[in-house]
Every structure is written in structure tokens, then in C-alpha cells.
């Protein structure tokens, strides 16, 4: 499959197609024209085709201006103005506003809690497997294996802090060198970006919203992948991260600090600990090859224990094996010594749902995974609905201007760096980059924050999570202080290096362009988002892991041709868009490849076949849920059910009538289906100004 599907024989115009999927720029509807639409009315559909820049063909119905789908939507205020309200109306509006704010904070609280439980669920399902990944001896010599282990473990436990703490304890115990740990940390950085990508999937209902949300989430992924792509070979060749951090650690005489303040956990822990509590030491113990830990459950049963240190007599093969000469004796048959043992007495059980069920970890994990995803999805929908009803008119304008506007000239360039600091600060406050970026995702989706602004906020979040790790490292006990601090600093400098690579010069902000490209593809073919998630976070790492286990010869044998093909395709793509005349006629487009290799359309047909019957069934039940939801969000006329059903209805009614569809350019036709138009509410009771 060509890297830019749907190319057909179109020669993309670099200016127009650089950020589009498959060289297409779908038009975004002007939301202002939609305000008077109701459930019953359908606007006429115009299908627009973008032709290659060198083509002489024209369209019958060519619009004067092609709207950029990445432009933020205008959220029109259809409510009565504040000045036009009577006292009763103003009071009612005020309390409505307060109510919405409380609801928003409530859903936000449960959103963060569900992220925490999602992490616990992943740890229960894949934590032990994750621990076993670490006990692979090849990590030491194979940085690529270390990288994919970092990705897989972090994806499996849904927490980079868990995987990095395992790495720290392994380095402290000399089971791993700092050199071998660095690729794992890089992998953990990639793995942690899956959370907000999962959150973005929850916004799949509305195409234009999903386009922005998914691009906003994957900008994090692309930043991490690209940073690793450049910095891992540099690190392997120069060991610059190891050297710099070693110098820092050795030049300072650090005293043990205090733990990083748990600000968000203080609020969420009372709730999450009622659901489930985990003994995270088990994963670390498995990673350190502790055989006993493999049979232990991750679900914490006893929360209050009494630890008593006592000395017990143990037999030794000979007096040479004694703990100390003075504590060595014989009973006439065996040689004995005294050993300090810690005896743990269970006093009080934990107070969480699963404490008395004695279910296997996999069962508890599966239950929690399903429930947390449902709560996450529900909260996200409600947050988006509430924000959507609040952020209209003046409020939206003020917020959007505040967030997305740059400083006045000549300080405009500083805005992004301030955003990086804000992202770092916010992440430090919430103590989790996943929580921060996941909270950012719906805001990008509904159009409050642009991807260009979300990018530095995300980069800041990457920095914020490492400052937390540095503080945590400073609070480590003496023996672990050096290693944990060095690893935390490696993580910090890796992210700093990544920012220096992919942020300062606008031209180098590749992650934004790649994310927008992926956003476009995923908006048209929504299954591709799930496909991307599986490929990048599971299949590629697992394939590299498998090949690494087979030996470096196999890895090189398979890897080199694959890398060569990728480079070849990228070079060809670049030449096609920049200077096609250099290439022979046949290579000026992808038409020489079979359709399934250059377009997602055939794949879409296959996926549609599989999902079609399921979609029909799911619509019936989602319609019921949707109506209840519509009543809650104060818009009784918006019940077109979900976007998936809307598309299905459209397909059945056969409303898509193209104005002109020449066979040649059929594959870059942009239909209403790719627009994701959503009828706006016509409710007159909307209240936005507080």
C-alpha cells in the first residue's frame, strides 16, 4: 500500500496536498449555515473533486473557495442574548451555568478516574506478561529489542511510570545497565502516547470532530516515533544521553529529596481505590526473575499488614556459608546460621470491590477494561456535549482567541514555548502526561484548540512527565538514587532533544503534518484509526520482538529489506510531489501498483463487509441511548442517533449524487460522507453567557 492512499493517477500539488490524506483536502462545512437545520431537513449535497494542479479539466460546480477542514468550526450561539433576558431568565441561566460547570467537573473527575482504572485493568490483563518481557536477557545487547519492550510493556500496563520504575529497580539491582535502559525509556515514551489515541477513538461519531481529535492525539505518537527514529541510532552510535546524564549525576552531590506531590491522585484515589487496588511490586518482581511472584495476584487483598523483623535459624552446607562467623554453629548433624527475616502478618483487608471475589487477574482485568472504557466513553461524550453547549458565541471566541492567538510581533515565536511550559506545568500538576493529553484530545476535537497549539502543549506534557520522574528519583533510597536519577534525566534529555529536532523550525514540525494526514485518512476510513493503533503499538513492536528473539541475523535479514522499501517509497513520494519530471512516466504516479496497494478503497470494502451487519444491530440499541442522551443535553430535536447510523441511513437512502464524477478522478471525490456534517441544535433555550 502506498503511503498516501487514494492517489489514483493524480499528481499531488505539494502546496495543497502535503497535509492531506491521499492528496485530498475535504471541504469543511460552514457551520454558520447549519444553524437552522433540524432533524427533518436535509441540505443538498455537493460533491467536490479536487483535480491535480497540472490538469486542464474543470468542474461544473466549482466552489469559489475551498474550506480547510482543519479550520476551527464556528460554534454559533443560538440562545437568547443576556441583555434580552428578564431577571427570572438571568437567574435561571446563572444556575444552569453553575449546573453545567458542576456536571463538567463531575464528568471530568470520572474521566480521569476511568483512565486510572483503565491503567489498572491493562496491568491486570498484561502486567505479568509485561514483567516477563523485561526478564529477556537479549535487552542488554539489542537496543531495538529494548525499544519495543519499552513500547509493549507501557502499552500493556498503560503507564510509563510503571515501566520506568521497573527499569530503575532493574538498574539498581545491576540486572540492567543504564545503556541498555535508555532504549526501553524511549519505548516507554512511545507507549504512553497510546492512551490519548484510545481517547480520540471515542470521538469517532462525528467525522470532522474525529479528524481533529485523532490528529491531535496522534501528533504525540508521531513526535515520539520520529524522535526515536532519529535519536536511537544517534544514542547507539554516540551514547550522548548516557554520557551527559552520567556527568550530571556525578557532578552533583544529591541529597534524597521528597516525593513529587500527588495533586490529582489525592482527589481521584479515594474513588479508584474503592474499585480496585493493585500490588504493583509483583510486576517488578517478575521482571527481576522472582519465580514466586509469577503465582502472585496483582489484586491487593491485604492493605494493613504488620511487618515483624526476626532472626531465624537456617541450615547451611558448611560453616563457610555462614552470614557471619559469630552466628555460625552446629547441632551435631547440620551447620546452622542466623538469618534476618521479615515476617508479614495480615491485619486488615483492602476495601475494594474485588477483594473477596478471588477471581483470576485476567477476569478482573477484563471486567475493569470493559467498564473503564464504557465510563471513559460516556464521560467523554458528556464532556464534549457540555463543552459544546457552553462554548458558543462570545465564550468560544474568547477562549479560542486566548488559547490559539500568538503574541504580537516580534514575540510571536515565544507563544509556542510558553505553551510548552504550560503543558509541562499542567502535567506536573496532574502527575500524568496521559491524563493531560487525554483531556486535551476532546478540546481539539470540538475545535477549542488547534493542532498547531496542541502540539507544543503535548511536547510540554512530555517534559512535565520527566520532571515528575526526576523528583521521584530524588526521593529514592540511597542505593537507587543514582540509577533512578540518571534514567529520569535520560528521559528528560531525550524529550528535550526531540523538541529541538521537531519544534523550533516550523519546517521541521513533521508530526503536525503527519498527524493531519492520518486524521484525514481516519476521518474518511474510520476503521483505519483502529488499524493504525494495532499496527503501531502492537504488531510492529511484537514483530521486532519476535525477530529479535530469533537472533540479530534474522532481524537484519528481514529489517533491512523492509527499511529499504520504506525509504524507496518515501523518496519516490517526495520526487512525485516535488519534481515528477525527473521520474519516468510510469513512476510519476502509483498507478503501476494494483489498486489494493495504493488505495484504501478495496480494504474499506472488505472492512465494511465485516462491520456491516454489526453496524445494523448496534444502531437499534444506540438510538435508544442517544435519545436519552439528547434529553439530558437539552436538545430534543438532535436525535439522529450516532454518526455511524447516520452514514448507514444515507447509504440506504442513496442520497449521494455527485455533480460530476469523471472515472479518472473517482477516488479523490469528496462526498458529504467525508465532511461529517452534524445538524446543529435549534433549541432557543440555549444559555451560554454566565
Amino acid at each position: 500500500m502506498a503511503p498516501w492512499p487514494e492517489l489514483g493517477d493524480a499528481q499531488p500539488n505539494p502546496d495543497k496536498y502535503l497535509e492531506g490524506a491521499a492528496g485530498q483536502q475535504p471541504t469543511a462545512p460552514d457551520k454558520s449555515k447549519e444553524t437552522n437545520k433540524t432533524d427533518n431537513t436535509e441540505a443538498p449535497v455537493t460533491k467536490i473533486e479536487l483535480l491535480p494542479s497540472y490538469s486542464t479539466a474543470t468542474l461544473i460546480d466549482e466552489p469559489t473557495e475551498v474550506d480547510d477542514p482543519w479550520n476551527l468550526p464556528t460554534l454559533q450561539d443560538s440562545g437568547i442574548k443576556w441583555s434580552e433576558r428578564d431577571t427570572k431568565g438571568k437567574i435561571l441561566c446563572f444556575f444552569q451555568g453553575i449546573g453545567r460547570l458542576i456536571l463538567l467537573l463531575g464528568f471530568l473527575y470520572f474521566f480521569v478516574c476511568s483512565l486510572d482504572i483503565l491503567s489498572s485493568a491493562f496491568q491486570l490483563v498484561g502486567g505479568k506478561m509485561a514483567g516477563q518481557f523485561f526478564s529477556n536477557s537479549s535487552i542488554m545487547s539489542n537496543p531495538l529489542l529494548g525499544l519495543v519492550i519499552g513500547v509493549l510493556v507501557t502499552v500493556l500496563v498503560q503507564s510509563s511510570s510503571t515501566s520506568t520504575s521497573i527499569v530503575v529497580s532493574m538498574v539498581s539491582s545491576s540486572l540492567l545497565t543504564v545503556r541498555a535502559a535508555i532504549p526501553i525509556i524511549m519505548g516507554a515514551n512511545i507507549g504512553t502516547s497510546i492512551t490519548n489515541t484510545i481517547v480520540a477513538l471515542m470521538q469517532v461519531g462525528d467525522r470532522s470532530e474525529f479528524r481533529r481529535a485523532f490528529a491531535g492525539a496522534t501528533v504525540h505518537d508521531f513526535f515520539n516515533w520520529l524522535s526515536v527514529l532519529v535519536l536511537l541510532p544517534v544514542e547507539v552510535a554516540t551514547h550522548y544521553l548516557e554520557i551527559i546524564t552520567q556527568l550530571i549525576v556525578e557532578s552533583f552531590h544529591f541529597k534524597n529529596g521528597e516525593d513529587a506531590p500527588d495533586l490529582l491522585k489525592v482527589i481521584t484515589k479515594p474513588f479508584t481505590k474503592l474499585i480496585v487496588q493493585l500490588d504493583k511490586k509483583v510486576i517488578s518482581q517478575i521482571a527481576m526473575n522472582d519465580e514466586k511472584a509469577k503465582n502472585k495476584s496483582l489484586v491487593k487483598i491485604w492493605c494493613k499488614t504488620f511487618t515483624n523483623k526476626t532472626q531465624i535459624n537456617v541450615t547451611v552446607p558448611s560453616t563457610a556459608n555462614c552470614t557471619s562467623p559469630s552466628l555460625c554453629w552446629t547441632d551435631g548433624i547440620q551447620n546452622w546460621t542466623m538469618k534476618n527475616v521479615t515476617y508479614k502478618e495480615n491485619i486488615a483487608k483492602c476495601q475494594h470491590i474485588f477483594v473477596n471475589f478471588h477471581l483470576p487477574d485476567l477476569a478482573v482485568g477484563t471486567i475493569l477494561l470493559i467498564l473503564s472504557l464504557l465510563v471513559l466513553c460516556g464521560c467523554l461524550i458528556m464532556i464534549v456535549k457540555i463543552l459544546g453547549s457552553v462554548l458558543k458565541g462570545q465564550v468560544a471566541t474568547v477562549i479560542k482567541k486566548t488559547i490559539n492567538t500568538d503574541f504580537p510581533f516580534p514575540f510571536a515565536w515565544l507563544t509556542g514555548y510558553l505553551a510548552i511550559l504550560v503543558g509541562a506545568g499542567m502535567t506536573f500538576i496532574v502527575q500524568s502526561s496521559s491524563v493531560f493529553t487525554s483531556a486535551l484530545t476532546p478540546l481539539i476535537g470540538i475545535g477549542v484548540i488547534t493542532i498547531e497549539r496542541a502540539y507544543p502543549l503535548t511536547l510540554g506534557s512530555n517534559i512535565g512527565t520527566t520532571t515528575t520522574a526526576i523528583l521521584a528519583a530524588l526521593a529514592s533510597p540511597g542505593n537507587a538514587l543514582r540509577s533512578s536519577l540518571q534514567i529520569a534525566l535520560c528521559h528528560f534529555f531525550f524529550n528535550i532533544s526531540g523538541i529541538l529536532l521537531w519544534y523550533p523550525i516550523p519546517f521541521t514540525r513533521l508530526p503536525i503534518r503527519m498527524a493531519k494526514g492520518l486524521g484525514n485518512i481516519s476521518a474518511k476510513y474510520r476503521w483505519f484509526a483502529v488499524f493504525y493503533l494495532i499496527i503501531f503499538f502492537f504488531l510492529i513492536p511484537l514483530t521486532v520482538f519476535g525477530l529479535s528473539l530469533a537472533g540479530w541475523r534474522v532481524l537484519v535479514g528481514v529489517g533491512v529489506p523492509v527499511v529499504f522499501i520504506i525509504i524507496l517509497v518515501l523518496c519516490l513520494r517526495l520526487l512525485q510531489s516535488r519534481c515528477p519530471r525527473v521520474l519516468p512516466k510510469k513512476l510519476q504516479n502509483w498507478n503501476f501498483l494494483p489498486l489494493w496497494m495504493r488505495s484504501l478503497k478495496p480494504w474499506d470494502a472488505v472492512v465494511s463487509k465485516f462491520t456491516g451487519c454489526f453496524q445494523m444491530r448496534c444502531c437499534c440499541c444506540c438510538r435508544v441511548c442517544c435519545r436519552a442522551c439528547c434529553l439530558l443535553c437539552d436538545c430534543p430535536k438532535c436525535c439522529r442517533c450516532s454518526k455511524c447510523c447516520e452514514d448507514l441511513e444515507e447509504a440506504q437512502e442513496g442520497q449521494d449524487v455527485p455533480v460530476k464524477a469523471p472515472e479518472t478522478f473517482d477516488n479523490i471525490t469528496i462526498s458529504r460522507e467525508a465532511q461529517g456534517e452534524v445538524p446543529a441544535s435549534d433549541s432557543k433555550t440555549e444559555c451560554t453567557a454566565l
Epitope: 535459624n313 541450615t315 560453616t319 562467623p325 559469630s326 552466628l327 555460625c328 554453629w329 552446629t330 547441632d331 551435631g332 548433624i333 547440620q334 551447620n335 546452622w336
Partner: antibody, heavy 119, light 107 residues
Framework: QVQLQQPGAELVKPGASVKMSCKAS????????MQWVKQTYGQGLEWIGA????????SYNQNFKVKATLTADKISSTAYMQLSSLTSEDSAVYYC????????????WGQGTLVTVSA | DIVMTQSHKFMSTSVGDRVSITCKAS??????VVWYQQKPGQFPKLLIY???TRHAGVPDRFTGSGSGTDFTLTISNVQSEDLADYFC?????????FGSGTKLEIK
């Protein structure tokens, strides 16, 4: 209470063997090690060896490795020590003593068996 | 083998006096030393183990001390019933070895 009963005396001819007994009562026989000690006027106290009645594991003083054989019968709660190829030097009082696992001291002793090797 | 040496074969004391019986090990035995008392015609009786721990029922006038190679059994306020042989024993390694004994006589 803990008791270790030993026959008072054994008279044997040189070159012969003797098997002396030590019947334990008042405790779980298999839970404690049984030690054997020789006392002569010239040599003082000498440790011969020990047996763990539960496992049958034995340990000997190299000086008595050939001379003594320690056994135990769990059913009758009796420990035995067989001395072979007796000479006049083997004439002594032989004590059995109980020691707990991981204890190298003897809190309970038998009355001792006086072995006299004489033609 | 570890040799336990009791340098005094005999020690003479009066009732009410304080007496110290010494025992020297040929190598470091830590605290793995035991003291026994054997009265004429009887079996040895445990007094002290782990160099200084008194066995149950032993009068507190009997005190053990020392570690490594030098050990002492002290009897304060000697009574006439204390007339006996006193043996030290090490249990640091196999074979267990005893001292040759010190006979306590009452003047």
C-alpha cells in the same frame, strides 16, 4: 517429663561388639537429635556422633567413624549405638543425650551405660 | 578439630566466695560455647549455653561470659552443693568438643 533410659552396664569380651540402647519418652522422638558421648577418666568427655531419628541422618566424630554405628527405631522411640571390635580402650561410660534441632547443647542426658571390655 | 582447653584441673574455694573457671578455644567459636556441671556419679547437667544464657532452673549465681576464644564461668557466693566437675563445650563446628574439665573443691 523427658526421660532417656539406658541399661546400667555391659560386659563384653575384646574383639566383640555391643549394641546399647537409649529409650526416649516424654517427647516426640523424631523431633530431636540424639547425641552420644563417651566419658573416660583419662580422656574426659568425647562426642561420638549424632542421629536425627526423623530422617535417619547421622554425623560422626572422625575418631569414632569406624568404631560406632548409630541407628534409631521410630516405633519403639529407641536410639541405638553399636560399638564394634572392642578393646580395653573402649571401656567407658556412654551417654545418650537429647538436643533440639539447631541446638548444639544437651539439656537432657541418659544415666549412662558403663561398658567394660574384659577377657 | 577445635580444641577446648581448661587450664585449671582443680580449683579450690570457700563457701560464699566467688570463683571463675576459664576455658580457651583453639580458634574463634563466636558465642557457641556451653557449660556443664557434673557431680560425682551423675550425668552432666546443662548450666549455660550460647556462652552466657542460663538454662532453665539454674541458679543466678552461675554466670557465663566471653566470646571468640576466651570464656569464663563465674560462680558467685559458692555453695557446698557446687562441689563438682565443670566442663565447657563448643558447638561451632563438627566434631563437638569438650574441655578436659575443672574440679571445684570446697575448702
Amino acid at each position: 517429663q523427658v526421660q532417656l533410659q539406658q541399661p546400667g552396664a555391659e560386659l563384653v569380651k575384646p574383639g566383640a561388639s555391643v549394641k546399647m540402647s537409649c529409650k526416649a519418652s516424654g517427647y516426640t522422638f523424631t523431633s530431636y537429635n540424639m547425641q552420644w558421648v563417651k566419658q573416660t577418666y583419662g580422656q574426659g568427655l568425647e562426642w561420638i556422633g549424632a542421629i536425627s531419628p526423623g530422617s535417619g541422618e547421622t554425623s560422626y566424630n572422625q575418631n569414632f567413624k569406624v568404631k560406632a554405628t548409630l541407628t534409631a527405631d521410630k516405633i519403639s522411640s529407641t536410639a541405638y549405638m553399636q560399638l564394634s571390635s572392642l578393646t580395653s580402650e573402649d571401656s567407658a561410660v556412654y551417654y545418650c543425650a537429647r538436643a533440639a534441632r539447631a541446638e548444639g547443647w544437651f539439656a537432657y542426658w541418659g544415666q549412662g551405660t558403663l561398658v567394660t571390655v574384659s577377657a | 578439630d577445635i580444641v577446648m582447653t581448661q587450664s585449671h584441673k582443680f580449683m579450690s574455694t570457700s563457701v560464699g566466695d566467688r570463683v571463675s573457671i576459664t576455658c580457651k578455644a583453639s580458634q574463634d567459636v563466636g558465642h557457641a560455647v556451653v557449660w556443664y556441671q557434673q557431680k560425682p556419679g551423675q550425668f552432666p547437667k546443662l548450666l549455660i549455653y550460647w556462652a552466657s544464657t542460663r538454662h532453665a532452673g539454674v541458679p543466678d549465681r552461675f554466670t557465663g561470659s566471653g566470646s571468640g576464644t576466651d570464656f569464663t564461668l563465674t560462680i558467685s557466693n559458692v555453695q557446698s552443693e557446687d562441689l563438682a566437675d565443670y566442663f565447657c563445650q563448643q558447638f561451632r563446628s563438627i566434631p563437638l568438643t569438650f574441655g578436659s574439665g575443672t574440679k571445684l573443691e570446697i575448702k
